[in-house]
């Protein structure tokens, strides 16, 4: 309705002359008033007092003259629909309507893509009263635009709760072209293929798009933007980087690096972090990832005494958190550890072999055969056993632990003897008579007591008898022997 | 690549601080050294710096410098300079070290990236 | 603390000729084979040669050759190029001791 009322609409004439060019002397505007921090209405003056404008709301009186005539439709008049300018230029447009002395608080405000502008804009609004009507031209200026000044603007008026609104002004900021989308650095596989992607945008339009590789161009003819670029493959790392133009000039990406995926480096740090009888909990710092993920590191370990196997036993875990416990190792042994770690691509190379040892532990065994027998004559219990395998003494023997329980009607009591490492037998006094004597041997180090042997029972009869045999360590699955004399 | 900075004439018992500032690789990925060069006299290890921060001396260098780092640099401070300590200081990358936590020492592998060195003269 | 004994210096020999540098240690060093030698040109930094007794580092041509284990190390260069004068470093590390020993030093003049 609006758009009709203004085609019909014959613009009340503001005065002689060329509008708004030179204007006359005696039209020279009552009031600008800039418009530093927002948009104040723009200001209405009673032409009965020129050239004193009113400060404040400005009542104009209704026209209540029988003799008046309908008044026209308001409308903004015609102005440039379209400008076309460079970036970081300066630009000026305006708007300009003449209302009727009538008409009362009317305001004027500026619209871009449908969203009022609020703000520090340079706006300025000019007041140019006359007898029957008050042109007024709203001027919009800024001052060095930037792409984002790109778009439609327009005023409105309101008036008597009727809103009127110009005709669009169209800005378009033209520059070099502006990138949307920049190619990306990449880790690829050697000799894979791969795509990078190049988006630039005007005004002005069209934007054309050169790769460039290590400095020389890709393709001789351009594309038009968007741009993908499929490289075939890659055998060592390259630079890529995009060329948009435009009727303005060029402008050139940023160069993105794409690195070749390889094996990893190995380790540069291995750290010994604890050492028990069995074993050692080590921590890494990986090399260089070969621009792909580390997935999972392996731990090398292998006995360092010369005249073991050379096996190597090998742990693999997890690369995270760089941080291993080798377990089922032997007690005071020496080991050689490394450490390689993995991505998608393969195995880095092992770190350089390091040294780490396990402390004394317990022994894991028992003495073997332990033999137990009464001997009479000197009222003592003779003990015999071997020694465990040194294999599985887990240190270095400093002797032996034994314990003998003497057991009779009612009455328990267990003694504890130390017995040197040299020996494999040992004599203990008789307890109690008329009683049974369960004895254990455990080897020591200084790692420890070791488990104790299967106990052997003998039993020590009253003065007076005679007959003694020995008592030893059962076989297997037998029920725990005891010989009575 | 590795840089050394911070070399100048100074007083005895002025205290001075050398920088190395790496590029290329970080600090908290490899562990770094100091060694240093009297006027046509050979090289003498100074201390190092773990990946993680630990810090280990030369016996005779000890309490005679101070070897801390950030990201990207590592510093060596010389608490009080004495004419013995003429000498180019060099940073150097540490290939490999192996750490014993548990006994509060450590070994290097090999020293496989240098920098060019910055001379400080000591002199009253 | 452990000290490393470089022999001879200065030692010269002719353009494609041989020159072995020995290198003594006082004790074994780590793992018996983490010793490693330096090459130093004057006015410039010293440079990575051989590590693991006788890994060669990258770069570093095949006429370099390093041998030994323990406590006894040597370098060999064979076919000698005038860009081989310089001055060598032998280096380890020593179990139970951070310390990092350099040798002496071997001055190799090229005729």
């Known amino acids: 309705a609006i758009t009709e009322a203004r085609e019909e609409a014959k613009p009340y004439p503001l005065f002689p002359g060329p509008f708004p060019g030179s204007l006359q002397t005696d039209h020279t505007p009552l009031l600008s008033l800039p418009h530093a921090s927002g948009y104040q209405p723009a200001l209405m003056f009673s032409p009965t007092q020129p050239g004193r404008p009113h400060t404040g709301n400005v009542a104009i009186p209704q026209v209540t003259s029988v003799e008046s005539k309908p008044l026209p439709p308001l409308a903004f008049k015609h102005t440039v629909g379209h400008i076309i300018l460079s970036e970081h230029k300066g630009v000026k447009f305006n708007c300009s309507i003449s209302v009727p002395n009538i008409y009362q608080d009317t305001t004027i405000s500026w619209w871009k893509d449908g969203k009022e502008l609020l703000g520090a804009h340079h706006a300025i609004t000019q007041f140019y009263p006359d007898d029957e009507v008050t042109a007024i031209i709203a001027s919009f200026s800024i001052t060095s635009v930037q792409r984002s000044d790109n778009g439609s603007y327009i005023c409105k008026m309101k008036i008597n709760n009727e809103e009127i609104v110009s005709d669009p002004i169209y800005i378009e900021v033209q520059g070099l072209p502006h990138f949307t989308k920049q190619p990306e650095s990449m880790n690829v596989t050697r000799n894979t293929a791969f795509n990078l992607t190049c988006q630039a945008v005007g005004p002005p339009e069209p934007v054309n798009i050169f790769w460039v590789q290590n400095s020389s161009r890709v393709n001789e003819q351009p594309e038009k933007s968007p741009s993908v670029l499929t490289v075939p493959g890659l055998t060592e790392m390259a630079v890529f980087s995009c060329e948009a133009h435009n009727d303005k000039g060029l402008t050139v990406s940023k160069g993105v690096q794409i690195n070749i995926k390889a094996i990893p480096s190995p380790p540069t740090e291995v750290s010994i972090r604890n050492s028990t009888a069995h074993s050692i909990l080590i921590s890494w710092v990986p090399g260089f990832d070969g621009y792909s993920p580390f997935r999972n590191c392996s731990i090398q370990v292998k006995e360092a005494d010369p005249l073991s196997n050379g096996s190597v036993m090998i742990f693999n875990t997890s690369a995270l958190p760089h941080l291993y416990q080798i377990k089922q190792l032997q007690a005071l042994a020496n080991y050689s550890i490394g450490v390689s770690c993995m991505n998608e691509i393969g195995w880095s190379a092992v770190s350089p072999w390091i040294l780490a040892s396990t402390t004394e532990g317990a022994p894991s065994v028992a003495p073997l055969n332990v033999t137990v027998f009464l001997n009479e004559s000197s009222d003592n219990v003779d003990i015999r056993w071997m020694k465990p395998p040194t294999k599985q003494q887990d240190g270095e023997l400093v002797g032996y632990r034994i314990s003998h329980v003497w057991q009779s009607a009612g009455i328990s009591k267990e003694l504890l003897e130390e017995v040197g490492q040299n020996g494999s037998r040992a004599r203990i006094s008789v307890q109690v008579h008329n009683a049974t004597c369960t004895v254990r041997i455990a080897a020591v180090t200084r790692g420890g007591v070791g488990p104790f042997s299967d106990p052997v029972k003998i039993f020590i009869p009253a003065h007076g008898w005679v007959d003694y045999a020995p008592s030893s360590t059962p076989a297997p699955g037998n029920a725990d022997p005891v010989l009575i004399i | 690549s590795v840089e050394e900075s911070g070399g100048r004439l100074v007083t005895p018992g002025t205290p001075l601080t050398l920088t190395c500032t790496v590029s290329?690789?970080?600090?908290?990925?490899?562990?770094m050294s100091w060694v240093r060069q009297a006027p046509g006299k050979g090289l003498e290890w100074i201390g190092i710096?773990?990946?993680?921060?630990s810090t280990y001396s030369a016996s005779w260098a000890k309490g005679r410098f101070t070897i801390s780092k950030t990201s990207t640099t590592m510093d060596l401070k010389i608490t009080s300079p004495t004419t013995e300590d003429t000498a180019t200081y060099f940073c150097?990358?540490?290939?490999?070290?192996?750490?014993?936590?548990?006994?509060?020492?450590?070994?290097?592998?090999?020293?496989?990236?240098w920098g060019q060195g910055t001379l400080v003269t000591v002199s009253s | 603390a452990a000290v490393l004994t470089q022999t001879p210096s200065p030692v010269s020999a002719a353009v494609g000729g041989t020159v072995s540098i020995s290198c003594q240690s006082s004790?074994?060093?780590?793992?018996?084979?983490?010793l490693s030698w330096y090459q130093q040109k004057p006015g410039q930094p010293p440079k990575l040669l051989i590590y693991?007794?006788?890994d060669l580092a990258s770069g570093v041509p095949s006429r370099f050759e390093g041998s030994g284990s323990g406590t006894e190390f040597t370098l060999t260069i064979s076919d000698l190029e005038c860009d081989d004068a310089a001055t060598y470093y032998c280096?380890?590390?020593?179990?139970?001791?951070?310390?990092?020993?350099f040798g002496g030093g071997t001055e190799v003049v090229v005729k």
């Open positions: 150097a990358r540490v290939g490999f070290f192996v750490g014993y936590g548990a006994y509060d020492y450590g070994i290097i592998h090999r020293l496989d990236l």
């Open positions: 290329g690789f970080s600090l908290s990925s490899n562990a």
């Open positions: 710096i773990s990946s993680s921060g």
């Open positions: 004790k074994s060093i780590y793992n018996n084979n983490w």
């Open positions: 693991d007794a006788s």
């Open positions: 280096a380890g590390g020593y179990s139970g001791d951070s310390d990092y020993a």
